[in-house]
Interface confidence: low
């Protein structure tokens, strides 16, 4: 699986998890957000060769296209595959305000 | 929607679903379909600015940081959304057979 | 880094063969596709053809039949076989990856980087 | 098979001043885009300026730039330096040919 375990240990070109911290103040402009400060979010990038953890028959079809076809500008691309949440605090006014965003956190990728 | 009724009738620069005909036997060397000779597969291609059909909360999330920091490699793909199956026509041996494909042609497309 | 080196070349007999290597590291064949190019002194650059990261070969039409385009990804090697060697293809060799444009395979752009430093192979008697 | 035209053969001018040179193509390069410019200097390899016909590589200084479609091509320079004193080449990439690569002759920029 092209997942954190296996990517973050290997230097793989190819499709794969990527490790990015994002500082929700800086990078973000998000000055709501009390705790964390910031967060692995996380992406997906690589190039997608033909069969490498295809979603669909199509992103299959089109990874042999791309492969029979280098000049063409029709490929799969490297997108999340597992996201999970992440648990934020922030304050309405003055009381504090505990929730769960959904789809944060990238752990897998997949060429679709 | 990112779909064909909509991309193909406008000169959309951003990400939308581009209409690819693939010919089985010159594109994919499959000699074994005996019908159709060919298809529209169809694409996603395009930037994906922030907001734009964000898939999740980690692609706006990412298409912001991205905004904010044109120079980071970590960016929303165009990737399929809504695909639909294909019928083909192969032989085994001289006996005819009929077989869906599931996920075969692209009809709208998503910022993942 | 990411590195081409080229080898292989020298002084060979008209209708006399050569293998060139092309040494690629800091990158995997399996992901990029490798061109070679030659220059003949003093004159343009002119495209021979590649290998894609698939293993599909394509070439130029006048090098189509003489030259032929192979790779070792274990090795970390692209190759030239030239067969027929002719003093016209006295010239400089360059192999180049296709510069990765975007997070997949979108093409190339045309964008030929980076290069080697070249190998030079002279056809004469 | 694509044939480039690069015009003027050779462009004497000197320092400060700006340098246009053309490339014409025999055919639609792909996407329309499909256009690089190289730099080369005696004794060197090829260095990439530009691809994708506008898109400045990095670390390329903006006095450099790339426009055109289609088949009409043009690189500028808008105040040359002593290190610009070079030959330049454009390659396109094509689709559907058989030479999926071509080079222009180039255009030697000389000290005036």
């Known amino acids: 699986a092209l997942d954190t375990n296996y990517c973050f240990r290997n230097l793989e070109e190819n499709c794969c998890v990527r490790p990015l911290y994002i500082d929700f103040r800086q990078d973000l402009g998000w000055k709501w957000v009390h705790e964390p400060k910031g967060y692995y979010a996380n992406f997906c990038s690589g190039p997608c060769p033909y069969l490498r953890s295809a979603d669909t028959t199509h992103s299959t079809v089109l990874g042999l296209y791309n492969t029979l076809n280098p000049e063409a500008s029709a490929s799969p691309c490297c997108v999340p595959q597992d996201l999970e949440p992440l648990t934020i605090l922030y304050y309405v006014g003055r009381t504090p305000k505990v929730e769960q965003l959904s789809n944060m956190v990238v752990k897998s990728c997949k060429c679709s | 929607a990112l779909d064909t009724n909509y991309c193909f009738r406008n000169l959309e620069e951003n990400c939308c679903v581009r209409p690819l005909y693939i010919d089985f036997r010159q594109d994919l060397g499959w000699k074994w379909v005996h019908e159709p000779k060919g298809y529209y597969a169809n694409f996603c291609s395009g930037p994906c600015p922030y907001l734009r059909s964000a898939d999740t909360t980690h692609s706006t999330v990412l298409g912001l940081y991205n905004t904010l920091n044109p120079e980071a490699s970590a960016s929303p793909c165009c990737v399929p959304q809504d695909l639909e199956p294909l019928t083909i026509l192969y032989y085994v041996g001289r006996t005819p057979k009929v077989e869906q494909l599931s996920n075969m042609v692209v009809k709208s497309c998503k910022c993942s | 880094e990411q590195q081409l080196v080229e080898s292989g070349g020298g002084l060979v007999q008209p209708g006399g063969s050569l293998r060139l290597s092309c040494a690629v590291s800091?990158?995997?064949?399996?992901?990029?596709?490798v061109n070679w190019v030659r220059q003949a002194p003093g004159k343009g650059l002119e495209w021979i053809g590649y290998?894609?990261?698939?293993?599909?070969?394509y070439y130029a039409s006048w090098a189509n039949g003489r030259f032929t385009i192979s790779k070792d990804s274990a090795k970390n090697s692209v190759y030239l076989q030239m067969n027929s060697l002719r003093a016209e293809d006295t010239a400089v060799y360059f192999c180049a990856r296709h510069m990765q444009v975007g997070g997949a395979p979108t093409g190339s752009m045309a964008a030929f980087d980076p290069w080697g430093p070249g190998t030079l192979v002279t056809v004469s008697s | 098979e694509a044939v480039l035209t690069q015009s003027p053969g050779t462009l004497s001018l000197s320092p400060g001043e700006r340098a246009t040179l053309s490339c014409q193509s025999s055919?639609?390069?792909?996407?329309?885009?499909?256009l690089s410019w190289f730099q080369q200097k005696p004794g060197q390899p090829p260095r990439l300026l530009i691809y994708?016909?506008?898109t400045l590589t990095s670390g390329v200084p903006d006095r450099f730039s790339g426009s055109g479609s289609g088949t009409d091509f043009t690189l500028t320079i808008s105040r040359l330096e002593p290190e610009d004193f070079a030959v330049y080449y454009c390659?396109?990439?094509?689709?559907?040919?058989?030479?999926?690569?071509?080079f222009g002759g180039g255009t030697k920029v000389e000290i005036k």
């Open positions: 800091g990158f995997s064949l399996s992901s990029y596709t």
């Open positions: 390659a396109g990439g094509y689709s559907g040919s058989s030479d999926k690569y071509a």
């Open positions: 994708g016909a506008s």
């Open positions: 290998i894609s990261y698939g293993g599909s070969a």
């Open positions: 055919q639609s390069v792909y996407n329309n885009n499909y």
